[in-house]
C-alpha cells in the first residue's frame, strides 16, 4: 500500500478579519494509526493550533467527525480571525508511539492571509492656532489594516492637496500595518468654515473609503482689525467714541478703554455679529464727559484677542474747543498710538 500523504490543497487562504478561516487537510491512508495536529509555523518555535488527541482549543472546530474510524478529513475552522492569526499553517500526522507520539508526515502548509480594515482615520492639526497665509501641518493616522497596500488622499474643501508625505509601517512583513501622513495646508482669511479631510482607500472597504476630518475653525486665528471713530455729539459735554473690532475669530476677545493711559472700562465680546465667512464683528463705545477733563484726552481702544498680545488703536480728543465734525481714524490695527489731532 502507498505511504500516507498529508494533503493541504490550498496554498493560501484569504480571510477578512472577524470571519472564520477554513484550513483544509486530508490524509491518503488510515495507516499508520495516530492523531493529527495543526501548527502555525515550522521548526522548534511553531505554535500548536489544534491537537486531535488532547487540549482545549475554543476557536477551533473540525469540519468532519474525527472520532469516526475511517475519517481521513482533518480540516479545521478557526473563528473570529484577527490579523495576528496570519501565517502558514501545517497539518501534521503523528504515529502512535510510546511514551510519546512521533511526527510522521506534514502537509505542505497553507498560508493564511488576513484582510483587516483600517481604523477610522484620525486627523490632528497644530498644537496652537495659526493665522491666515501661514502653512500648517495636519497629520492623519490609521491602523490595523492588512494587506499593506493602501491609498491615502488629502482634501481641503473638496480640493485635493498635493503637498503631503505618507509612510506605511512596518516596512517589512507584518500581521497588520499602520499609515501616517502629514499634509501642509495654507490657511486663508476665509477658512473658518473650511475642512481638511484625510481619505483612506483599502481593498477591505469595497470602494467606500474611510474619511477623517479636521475643522479649520479649531486651527485658525483671524486677528481683528480696529477702527476708532468719534460719533456726532450727543450732548453739549459728551462725546461718543466707538471702537469697531472687525473680522476676528475665534470669538474670545477682551476690550479695554483707556483714557490718558488709565483704564476706564473693560468688557468681553458677547453680542457679536457673525460674518458670512465665519468671522465676527463687534463694536464697543465709550461716552466721554469732556467737561470732566481740563486737558486733551487720548482715548485708546485696547484689544486682547484669543490670549494674544494686546493691540490698540488710539484717538486724540481735543477738549479746548467744541467738536465740530465727526473724526475718523481708519488705520486697521496697531500696537502704538495715533498722534494725529482729529479736530
Amino acid at each position: 500500500e502507498e505511504e500516507l500523504q498529508v494533503i493541504q490543497p490550498d496554498k493560501s487562504v484569504l480571510v477578512a478579519a472577524g470571519e472564520t478561516a477554513t484550513l483544509r487537510c486530508t490524509a491518503t491512508s488510515l495507516i499508520p494509526v495516530g492523531p493529527i495536529q495543526w501548527f502555525r509555523g515550522a521548526g522548534p518555535g511553531r505554535e500548536l493550533i489544534y491537537n486531535q488527541k488532547e487540549g482545549h482549543f475554543p476557536r477551533v472546530t473540525t469540519v468532519s467527525d474525527l472520532t469516526k474510524r475511517n475519517n481521513m478529513d482533518f480540516s479545521i475552522r478557526i473563528g473570529n480571525i484577527t490579523p495576528a492569526d496570519a501565517g502558514t499553517y501545517y497539518c501534521v500526522k503523528f504515529r502512535k508511539g510510546s511514551p510519546d507520539d512521533v511526527e510522521f508526515k506534514s502537509g505542505a502548509g497553507t498560508e493564511l492571509s488576513v484582510r483587516a480594515k483600517p481604523s477610522a482615520p484620525v486627523v490632528s492639526g497644530p498644537a496652537a492656532r495659526a493665522t491666515p497665509q501661514h502653512t500648517v501641518s495636519f497629520t492623519c493616522e490609521s491602523h490595523g489594516f492588512s494587506p499593506r497596500d493602501i491609498t491615502l488622499k488629502w482634501f481641503k474643501n473638496g480640493n485635493e492637496l498635493s503637498d503631503f508625505q505618507t509612510n506605511v509601517d512596518p516596512v517589512g512583513e507584518s500581521v497588520s500595518y499602520s499609515i501616517h501622513s502629514t499634509a501642509k495646508v495654507v490657511l486663508t482669511r476665509e477658512d473658518v468654515h473650511s475642512q481638511v479631510i484625510c481619505e483612506v482607500a483599502h481593498v477591505t472597504l469595497q470602494g467606500d473609503p474611510l474619511r477623517g476630518t479636521a475643522n479649520l475653525s479649531e486651527t485658525i486665528r483671524v486677528p481683528p482689525t480696529l477702527e476708532v471713530t468719534q460719533q456726532p455729539v450727543r450732548a453739549e459735554n459728551q462725546v461718543n467714541v466707538t471702537c469697531q473690532v472687525r473680522k476676528f475669530y475665534p470669538q474670545r476677545l477682551q476690550l479695554t478703554w483707556l483714557e490718558n493711559g488709565n483704564v476706564s472700562r473693560t468688557e468681553t465680546a458677547s453680542t457679536v455679529t457673525e460674518n458670512k465667512d465665519g468671522t465676527y464683528n463687534w463694536m464697543s463705545w465709550l461716552l466721554v464727559n469732556v467737561s470732566a477733563h481740563r486737558d486733551d484726552v487720548k482715548l485708546t481702544c485696547q484689544v486682547e484677542h484669543d490670549g494674544q498680545p494686546a493691540v490698540s488703536k488710539s484717538h486724540d480728543l481735543k477738549v479746548s474747543a467744541h467738536p465740530k465734525e465727526q473724526g475718523s481714524n481708519t488705520a486697521a490695527e496697531n500696537t502704538g498710538s495715533n498722534e494725529r489731532n482729529i479736530y
Epitope: 493665522t131 501661514h134 494725529r340
Partner: antibody, heavy 119, light 107 residues
Framework: EVQLQESGAELVRPGASVKLSCKAL????????IHWVKETPVYGLEWIGD????????ANNQKFKGKATLTADKSSNTAYMELSSLTSEDSAVYYC????????????WGQGTSVTVSS | DIQMTQSSSSFSGSLGDRLTINCKAS??????VAWYQQKPGNAPRLLIS???SLETGVLSRFSGSGSGKDYTLSINGLQAEDVATYYC?????????FGGGTKLEIK
C-alpha cells in the same frame, strides 16, 4: 526688555550651508512670529518668511523656497534659519524680527548677522 | 507680489523743514503699512504701523497718513538725528514687501 540676539558673522564657501540663530529674550516666545529679512545693497530689504513657534505655522517668500528653511526650538526660545547651496547672491545681512501673530508690523529687530559667501 | 514704490530714493532737507516721503502700493493694502528708520550700520527700527500709529518712544514730529494704495511719512521739523534711510513695508499679503528706501540727508 525684548531682545533678539542673533548669531555671529559667517564666512562660508560657495555650495555650503549655514544655520543662523536668533535667541528671543524678554517675552513669551510662542506668542509671536519670528520673521527673517535679508538686506543687500542691490535689493534693499527683502522678507524671507516667518515662523510661529506656538503653532509651527510658516509663511514663505517663494523667491527663497528651497534656499531658506525656518525652524524654532521652543525649549531654548531660539529660531533658526538654514540657508543652503550658498552662492555670492546670498551674501547679505540677515535680520530676525518679531511680530504679533497676524497682520502686524515687525516691532523688534535683531542686530543682524552678516553672511559672506566666498571661495 | 505687491510692489511698494517709494518715489524718491534720496531727499535733502534743511534743519527744521517739514518733509514727506511717499509710498505707493500696487494694490489696496488696507492700512497695513509700516515705516522703518535705518541708520548706517544699524538694524531698521519701527516708527509707525497701521498707517498712522507711532510706536512707543517715537517722537511726535513723525506722523503717517494714507489709505488704499497711497501712504505718506511726514517729519515735521527735521533734526540732524533724522539722517537715515526710511522704508515703507506692507503686511497685508505675503510675501511682505518693502519699498526701495528713501535716503534722507541734511543740506
Amino acid at each position: 526688555e525684548v531682545q533678539l540676539q542673533e548669531s555671529g558673522a559667517e564666512l562660508v564657501r560657495p555650495g555650503a550651508s549655514v544655520k543662523l540663530s536668533c535667541k528671543a529674550l524678554g517675552y513669551t516666545f510662542t506668542d509671536y512670529e519670528i520673521h527673517w529679512v535679508k538686506e543687500t545693497p542691490v535689493y534693499g530689504l527683502e522678507w524671507i518668511g516667518d515662523i510661529h513657534p506656538g503653532s509651527g505655522g510658516t509663511a514663505n517668500n517663494q523667491k527663497f523656497k528651497g534656499k531658506a528653511t525656518l525652524t524654532a526650538d521652543k525649549s531654548s526660545n531660539t529660531a533658526y534659519m538654514e540657508l543652503s547651496s550658498l552662492t555670492s547672491e546670498d551674501s547679505a545681512v540677515y535680520y530676525c524680527t518679531r511680530a504679533v501673530s497676524g497682520y502686524y508690523a515687525m516691532d523688534y529687530w535683531g542686530q543682524g548677522t552678516s553672511v559672506t559667501v566666498s571661495s | 507680489d505687491i510692489q511698494m514704490t517709494q518715489s524718491s530714493s534720496s531727499f535733502s532737507g534743511s534743519l527744521g523743514d517739514r518733509l514727506t516721503i511717499n509710498c505707493k502700493a500696487s494694490e489696496d493694502i488696507y492700512d497695513r503699512v509700516a515705516w522703518y528708520q535705518q541708520k548706517p550700520g544699524n538694524a531698521p527700527r519701527l516708527l509707525i504701523s497701521g498707517t498712522a500709529s507711532l510706536e512707543t518712544g517715537v517722537l511726535s514730529r513723525f506722523s503717517g497718513s494714507g489709505s488704499g494704495k497711497d501712504y505718506t511719512l511726514s517729519i515735521n521739523g527735521l533734526q540732524a538725528e533724522d539722517v537715515a534711510t526710511y522704508y515703507c513695508q506692507q503686511y497685508w499679503t505675503t510675501p511682505w514687501t518693502f519699498g526701495g528706501g528713501t535716503k534722507l540727508e541734511i543740506k
